[in-house]
Interface confidence: medium
């Protein structure tokens, strides 16, 4: 029998330009009579235009929902009922071509054409995009709170906040032709559940979503988003009821930035410059295409690209790259945001140079991408270190810590975390190197102690970038570096003149002058340590809860011993800046470190002094007795201590600790404690210092109290943030 043809609804969204009308502010108010009258006329014109083409037989409904500048731009959607088998034949491109063809055919015609009765439509200004029923529903839900704004060249327009009686609002933004819009979002509250979505078109079309942000993100307190052109839509969905806008939105038109460059690299190793997407750190725009051509001076070198929190991966089956597509020497790679550093190493085989292309394959974009570029020696990519093939990074080899995810940096070591004698490859402990006492058969541990040596895992790098053989030479009272830099910044790590933690003892005043108490509303929350005149270091997890994220909540006490009373040596500070490590991951506790900038510099005294920071190469030997201090609970689940407690703990080899915690211990962690438990940090000690005393008598910061299973439990050591693993970030921030 006859089978009825299946019809499907095909939704289109778009805009057209009217040359004989001008936009007026009245048209931004949906309740105005001007808006109602203009919509009625525009709607009639749109329907007549569609029905004048062979699309007429499929016409179902249409709506003009907004107007804009240019002289007058009408924004609309319409629905066609199409036989299912013709669905693909009527793509937005085909529909646009049919409508343009119709408009062009009547441009010079003297005949009366219904849709030209009032409007002179510009054929070149017609845009048709694919939409969905869901998109139209989303659009309709915002029409009660619909804001149109035109922003002129050189202007920065701050958008009026949402109407809190509405559950959803839409800002329709437009700028001058040939410019692109840059939207800036700044979260102003510590906590909220609001959702904002940015689109590369006038309405909320899911397929043209640039990005969506949610709930006063602490990771991104400020977000800048680029559209591909002069039109953009921002949709707000209400979270918790609030009388205050949890965000500030501003928009400005910016010129297109070319993203093409030809560079010739110098004949030297290390980073030589930076490549980035336009307007970095803004999100890259949906139609970004960058092409960088780099010429390498010699085939001895390869090209290294160092990324920050972004990696390149091979993508299976030609699927689109959702976080940026890269082509490097005809290899297609996809970008991936990660909470780790990453390097891509490109072997150079021809002097023609290397072309690197970056493209946003889909409208969904992400934070701008920045990459440092430089050369590496192809025959020895990581002098004195190990090249980790998993992430392209140079990592310390044979130091007892698996820095490379596959652990190969700790494989095939002749001597692990020890010094290898030249004579017979026997291994001696590092403190015995350059100590004036020959321990190797022919004394090779005492050779080259007064001269520069090739840099390696345990060598100390001086400011002039030369290296010295003596392990841990910092601040030991004798210059080992030619430039004396190992004895600079040494006003640290000395205890004041002074004669709970689980299993601990009470500290005396001035005994741990770097110890900080981080308090909220008079209540001790976390420990910390003074590392410079305006900087206190602590654990990032202290600020994990949204309610703890604001700097205004925190007071930092230094020189404190007793929680319930004050003494003259005690000082307090407000916090002007709070910086969490950019790679901090709450679930894994990785990179558990934060820096607090104090509102004014400390005045050093017997009770208030900074602790010494170790160099990246500083070796804290397993078995070493170090100390933790804090006001944390004296027993698991107990209340915090009134007196500052101190307890000695032993540093544990990474491999053992990793086994105990089922391989959740990362290279940025360090373990200390005892296998029998009893002595350990506990709740309230978080962020507090784990310090080790050097032979010079100075105390160096080895770790920060981070996590562990319970407190003082047998077999479960305390896990600390390994300071040498995050020192480069600390130095970058503090200096």
């Amino acid at each position: 029998g006859y089978k009825a043809e299946v019809m499907v609804s095909q939704v289109y969204s778009g805009s057209l330009r009217v040359l004989n009308r001008h936009f007026s502010q009245d048209l931004t108010r949906r309740e105005s009579s001007a808006f109602r009258s203009e919509t009625a006329k525009a709607q009639k014109m749109l329907k007549e235009l569609i029905t004048s083409t062979r699309l007429g037989t499929y016409y179902n409904s249409s709506s003009v929902y907004s107007f804009g500048e240019g002289p007058l731009t009408c924004f609309f959607w319409f629905i066609l009922q199409i036989p299912e088998h013709r669905r693909l034949m009527l793509s937005p491109e085909v529909v646009q071509a049919l409508l343009v063809e119709e408009l062009l055919s009547t441009v010079n015609s003297s005949a009366a054409v219904p849709y030209r009765a009032e409007y002179e439509v510009d054929p070149e200004g017609l845009v048709i995009l694919e939409a969905s029923v869901k998109d139209i529903a989303a659009l309709n839900s915002t029409l009660g709170c619909y804001r149109y704004s035109y922003v002129g060249q050189g202007q920065v327009l701050r958008l009026k906040g949402p109407d809190h009686l509405a559950s959803s609002c839409l800002w329709h933004l437009q700028g001058p032709k040939d410019l692109m819009l840059k939207l800036r979002l700044e979260w102003t509250l510590a906590e909220c559940r609001d959702r904002l979505a940015m689109y590369d078109v006038a309405g909320p079309l899911e397929k043209r979503l640039i990005t969506s942000v949610y709930g006063c993100s602490r990771q991104e307190p400020v977000v800048e988003v680029l559209a591909s052109g002069a039109i953009m839509a921002v949709v707000w969905k209400k979270g918790l009821h609030s009388y205050y806008d949890p965000f500030v939105l501003s928009v400005q038109p910016v010129v297109f930035q070319a993203c093409e460059v030809n560079l010739t690299l110098d004949n030297r190793l290390d980073s030589q410059g930076v490549l980035s997407t336009p307007y970095f750190p803004s999100y890259y725009s949906p139609q970004t295409h960058c092409s960088w051509h780099l010429t390498v001076p010699s085939l001895d070198y390869g090209l290294a690209l160092w990324f920050d929190a972004y990696a390149l991966r091979r993508q299976k089956y030609d699927l689109p790259c959702t976080q940026g597509q890269w082509t490097i020497q005809n290899r297609r790679l996809c970008g991936l945001r990660i909470l780790q550093p990453y390097a891509e190493r490109i072997p150079v085989v021809a002097t023609a140079g290397i072309t690197i292309n970056f493209t946003s394959q889909i409208s969904l974009t992400g934070p701008g991408v920045r990459v440092h570029y430089g050369l590496y020696n192809q025959s020895d990519p990581c002098p004195g270190e190990f090249l980790c093939s998993v992430n392209g990074l140079c990592v310390p080899a044979c130091d007892g810590v698996k820095d490379c995810p596959n652990g190969l940096d700790e494989r095939n070591c002749v001597c692990r975390a020890t010094f290898q004698c030249k004579e017979d490859s026997t291994c001696i402990s590092l403190p015995k190197v350059c100590d004036g006492q020959p321990d190797c058969l022919n004394g090779s541990d005492e050779e080259q102690c007064q001269e520069g040596v090739p840099c390696g895992t345990f060598t100390f790098q001086c400011e002039d970038r030369s290296c010295v053989k003596k392990p841990n030479p910092q601040c030991d009272g004798r210059p080992d570096c030619r430039d004396g830099s190992d004895e600079e910044h040494c006003d640290c790590g000395l205890q004041g003149p002074s004669s709970r933690i689980v299993g601990g003892a009470v500290s005396s005043e001035g005994e741990w002058p770097w110890q900080a108490s981080l308090q909220v509303r008079g209540r001790h929350i976390c420990g910390g340590a003074l590392i410079a005149d305006r900087w206190v270091i602590t654990a990032a997890h202290c600020f994990q809860e949204d309610s703890m994220a604001s700097t205004v909540l925190w007071t930092v006490f230094l020189g404190k011993v007793w929680q319930n009373s004050r003494w003259p040596g005690e000082v307090s500070f407000k916090v002007s800046r709070l910086l969490l490590h950019p790679y901090h991951e709450e679930d894994s506790h990785d990179y558990d470190v934060a820096l607090l900038q104090l509102d004014h510099p400390v005045v050093r005294s017997a009770a208030v002094r900074p602790v010494c920071l170790p160099a990246r190469s500083h070796f804290f030997e397993p078995g070493l007795h170090c100390w933790i201090t804090g006001w944390g609970a004296l027993r698991e689940g107990g209340p915090i201590s009134n007196a500052l407690q101190k307890v000695d703990v032993q540093l544990i080899p990474q491999d053992l600790c990793s086994e105990v915690y089922r391989y959740q211990v990362t290279p940025r962690m360090l373990c200390a404690g005892y296998r029998k438990g009893k002595k350990d940090a506990c709740q309230g000690d978080s962020g507090g210092p784990l310090v080790c005393k050097a032979l010079s008598g100075r105390w160096f910061l080895a770790g920060l109290v981070s996590w562990g299973l319970g407190c003082g439990r047998p077999n479960y050591f305390g896990v600390y943030t390994r300071i040498t693993g995050v020192i480069s970030w600390i130095q970058q921030v503090v200096t």
Epitope: R411, N412, C413, D655, Y674, R675, K676, K678
Partner: antibody
């Protein structure tokens, strides 16, 4: 005097079970990891099993896994090895050993006190 | 887990030095610094001589010294004495709370 004394060995038929005991004295038993190690006459030492002081980490050699069970009773200062499904190749002198003493130190995997051993002979 | 490899025998005259080797893999001796050495006189229980590659328990003479290079650990007995004649066993931690022993070396004082 620090001492470990094994008992419970003897002649046993293959497939049967036997339970070895080790009585500890002269030291704080519940602060030490304990081990069972065996030695086939005229041959080398073979680690069999270990148990931490609170019995929360237990490990076995592949050769005995699923057949032998180590346990301890800290109140009685005693270590046990329950041996099931015995085989001829289990014939050996069985030593109980204590992990090296140390002031709260981390694991040494070294045994500083040994008993004199108890002989187990499995006949097929 | 497979046993560590030790030479079956070694010998030296009184006053001389003898070095015993113990070869494992990169997963035991090569990876961990938990190599121990034991001395066993006939009919007696083993006695701990070295732990953590090179540390001596109290009461062990300093004639006994340990070292390690890559996957091989060594025990050196210098100033050999008659009472040093015995079987020597090495052991290593092998991960996952397991310990592995060597087959033993019989040392003869000539």
């Amino acid at each position: 005097e620090v001492q470990l004394v094994e008992s419970g060995g003897g002649l046993i038929q293959a497939g049967r079970s036997l339970r070895l005991s080790c009585a500890a004295s002269g030291f704080t038993f519940d602060e030490h990891v304990m081990y069972w190690v065996r030695q086939i006459p005229g041959k080398g030492l073979e680690w069999i099993s270990s148990i931490t002081w609170k019995s929360d980490i237990i490990a076995y050699a592949d050769s005995v896994k699923g057949r032998f069970t180590i346990s301890r009773d800290n109140a009685k200062n005693a270590l046990y090895l329950q041996m099931n499904s015995l085989r001829a190749e289990d014939t050996a002198l069985y030593y109980c050993a204590r992990e090296k003493d140390g002031d709260f130190y981390y694991y040494y995997f070294a045994m500083d006190v040994w008993g004199q051993g108890t002989t187990v002979t499995v006949s097929s | 887990q497979s046993a560590l490899t030790q030479p079956p025998s070694a010998s030296g005259s009184p006053g001389q030095s003898v070095t015993l080797s113990c070869t494992g893999t990169s997963s035991d001796v090569g990876y961990y610094n938990y190599v121990s050495w034991y001395l066993q006189h006939p009919g007696k229980a083993p006695k701990l001589m070295i732990y953590e590659v090179s540390k001596r328990p109290s009461g062990v003479p300093d004639r006994f010294s340990g070292s390690k290079s890559a996957n091989t650990a060594s025990l050196t007995v210098s100033g050999l004495q008659a009472e040093d004649e015995a079987d020597y066993y090495c052991s290593s931690y092998a991960g996952s709370n397991k310990v592995v022993f060597g087959g033993g070396t019989k040392v003869t004082v000539l």
